[in-house]
């Protein structure tokens, strides 16, 4: 029997890409091994190759299509398995029956731009990417601004709890070098978390007036 | 090798409860993934219900969802299936099965690797 603690976690971009994480302790680094997909009421399969990421876990895409192609539904049910070449044969380590639209984590936020800055306010905006039209206005996100002398993990978090794809930040510091990330989830899914943080947009303030506070 | 015994089944009435037992030998139940697989006359083999290893995170077709329930005796290495609300559509051959990885499968009960050789369960007024 398969011995050691076992994960094998994944999530659907909500189009065209189911991302794969899996670990063992005690595996082997040097074992070959796969995600195999067979979803449950379509004509496709698909593969990936599970690469190392850390002493022991390995991770891997399966790209089902075109970045923005609907692959999958909230009906679809896709069987993930994780194969490892032992000697000649395949074992199966892992199984799990995935619902996509159960394991939602979407792609990071992109096209991250200053619409307007001043002295004390920034207004920004950004694009989701890949993300289904299934839903619809079902989005929230989370942004956070790094100020000066501070670490991201210390930035306090603005949540946005409906699809709005910009943000108004006020009370800023004039002639002050800021950086901002975002990051969005569905509402759906019971096992859904949150994308990637977006890359960080960095921008200034308009230094004060002369003569003015 | 590991073998795989069932009991606990027989004929009760529509609205009655069951509790099949599987038996688990040659290997320890904690090492594998767990599955209820059941056959109607004339159908394909539905995986009812299944729980991982390690996590022990349980799993229900939505046919049985709230009605039965999965759960494991270490000490005796004996998985049980706890049956309720039973229907006439529940009257099948229930297999007991196990799966030489972590997680487990409804979708797919041919994914296996060892099986029991099932107890009828016939639900009849």
């Known amino acids: 029997a398969v011995n050691g603690t076992s994960r094998f976690t994944c999530f659907y971009n909500s189009r065209a890409n189911i991302s794969c994480v899996w670990s063992q302790d005690g595996a082997l680094q040097d074992t070959s091994c796969q995600v195999h997909a067979w979803p449950d009421r379509r004509r496709w399969n698909q593969t990936c190759e599970l690469l190392p990421v850390s002493q022991a876990s390995w991770a891997c895409n399966l790209i089902l299509g075109t970045p923005d192609s609907q692959k999958l539904t909230a009906v679809d049910i896709v069987t993930l398995r994780v194969m490892c070449r032992e000697g000649v044969r395949w074992r199966m380590m892992a199984i799990q029956d995935f619902k996509p639209f159960e394991n939602l984590r979407l792609m990071a936020p992109i096209s991250l731009q200053v619409v307007h800055v001043e002295t004390h306010r920034c207004n920004i905006s950004w694009k989701i990417s890949q993300a289904s039209h299934y839903f619809e206005r079902h989005l929230e996100f989370e942004a956070r601004t790094l100020s000066p002398g501070h670490t991201w993990e210390e930035a306090p978090l603005m949540t946005l709890k409906q699809k709005q794809e910009w943000i108004c930040l006020e009370t800023l510091t004039p002639d002050t070098q800021y950086e901002f990330q975002v990051r969005v989830k569905p509402l759906q899914g019971e096992f859904t978390t949150w994308s990637p943080w977006s890359q960080p947009l960095a921008f200034r303030t308009k230094p004060a007036a002369l003569g003015k506070d | 090798q590991v073998q795989l015994v069932e009991s606990g089944g027989g004929l009760v009435q529509p609205g009655g409860s069951l509790r099949l037992s599987c038996a688990i030998s040659?290997?320890?139940?904690?090492?594998?993934?767990i599955g209820w697989v059941r056959q109607a006359p004339g159908k394909q083999r539905e995986g009812v219900s299944c729980m991982s290893r390690s996590d022990d995170r349980t799993y229900y077709a939505d046919s049985v969802k709230g009605r039965f329930t999965i759960s494991k005796d270490s000490a005796k290495n004996t998985v049980y299936l706890q049956m309720t609300s039973l229907k006439p559509e529940d009257t099948a051959v229930y297999y007991c099965a196990a799966v030489d990885a972590y997680g487990c499968s409804l979708v797919q009960p041919t994914t296996y690797d060892f099986w029991g050789l099932g107890t009828q369960v016939t639900v009849s007024s």
């Open positions: 040659g290997g320890t139940l904690d090492s594998y993934g």
